[in-house]
């Protein structure tokens, strides 16, 4: 778990990006919720389950997908940045670097098809934002947020999707259990 | 290695109020300033209940907490808290704080503290 400093945002939903169904067979780099029974990688990845939930009745294990978002680039970060020391410049140009995970490919919600085009409009009680932020913190965290769609990947990575993560499908956040067949259809735009 | 460690959970009654903090911890970190608390209540899905970014000048809330719930970060102490005030039993839930922007997604994530809103 280290790097030089906190993070930008949390994840975006997206087209598939060139070279990532290539590297979907990565895709257990994904986090996972480890117990005993998990393999070694997934117990590396060591994302703890609270002890309290086992408890009340939440399910063991539910796995939680790391969106990994290529196009999202720091033009200056250095190592001296810690969690809380502002906000990011961003590139908003696309990375053909392939990568597990769900990545930036055909403009989806941060990358937007038409650089002029103007932030989506949210409420203020939802969502504050300052202006001229090049990067929306509503676009980043996109993906967790109710309604998210994911986009359909090549029969063979939603394979290997299904066979990694068995619990049903997670209604809009697509955080923990399979990312939803039924929302990999469409590309989420606001 | 970054660890992320949640306080201020517990019991509390009904309309009551909760001030959770996150504090980052281990060295140095990944990306740049978001910080975002989960919550995942018994048999539920984990959601995003509020994120941030920097200090404060770009904010999220779920619906179903805005107007009680408030998210904030002090830069100096490397924390993010989630002030919540008026709540329901219904906010009865393990919440998370995750951090840790690393070219899309949370990569370092608290143990959670539970929070119990009950007579």
């Known amino acids: 778990m280290g790097g030089n400093s906190m993070a930008s945002g949390v994840g975006v939903g997206a087209g598939l990006g060139a070279g990532v169904n290539q590297r979907m067979d990565s895709y257990a780099h994904m986090n996972g919720w480890s117990n005993g029974s998990y393999s070694m990688m997934q117990d590396q990845l060591g994302y703890p389950q609270h002890p309290g939930l086992n408890a009340h009745g939440a399910a063991q294990m539910q796995p939680m997908h790391r969106y990994d978002v290529s196009a999202l680039q720091y033009n200056s970060m250095t190592s001296s940045q810690t969690y809380m020391n502002g906000s990011p410049t961003y590139s908003m140009s696309y990375s053909q670097q392939g990568t597990p995970g769900m990545a930036l490919g055909s403009m989806g919600s941060v990358v937007k098809s038409e650089a002029s085009s103007s932030p989506p409009v949210v409420t203020s009680s939802s969502h504050s934002r300052a202006p001229c932020q090049a990067g929306d913190l509503r676009d980043m965290i996109s993906m967790y947020l109710p309604g998210a769609e994911v986009p359909e990947p090549a029969a063979p990575s939603r394979l290997h999707m299904s066979q990694h993560y068995q619990s049903g499908p997670v209604p809009g956040t697509a955080i923990n259990g399979t990312l939803p067949l039924s929302h990999m259809h469409h590309h989420h735009h606001h | 290695e970054v660890q992320l460690v949640e306080s201020g959970g517990g019991l509390v009654q009904p309309g009551g109020s909760l001030r959770l903090s996150c504090a980052a911890s281990?060295?140095?970190?990944?990306?740049?300033?978001?910080m975002g608390w989960f919550r995942q209540a018994p048999g539920k899905e984990r959601e995003l209940v509020a994120a941030?970014?920097?200090?404060?000048?770009?904010?999220y809330y779920a619906d179903s907490v805005k107007g009680r719930f408030t998210i904030s970060a002090d830069n100096s102490k490397n924390t993010a808290y989630l002030q919540m005030n008026s709540l329901k039993p219904e906010d009865t839930a393990v919440y998370y704080c995750?951090?840790?922007?690393?070219?899309?997604?949370?990569?370092?994530w608290g143990q959670g503290t539970l929070v119990t809103v009950s007579s």
């Open positions: 941030i970014r920097g200090s404060g000048e770009d904010t």
């Open positions: 995750a951090g840790g922007w690393r070219r899309g997604y949370f990569q370092d």
């Open positions: 281990g060295g140095g970190f990944r990306g740049n300033a978001v």
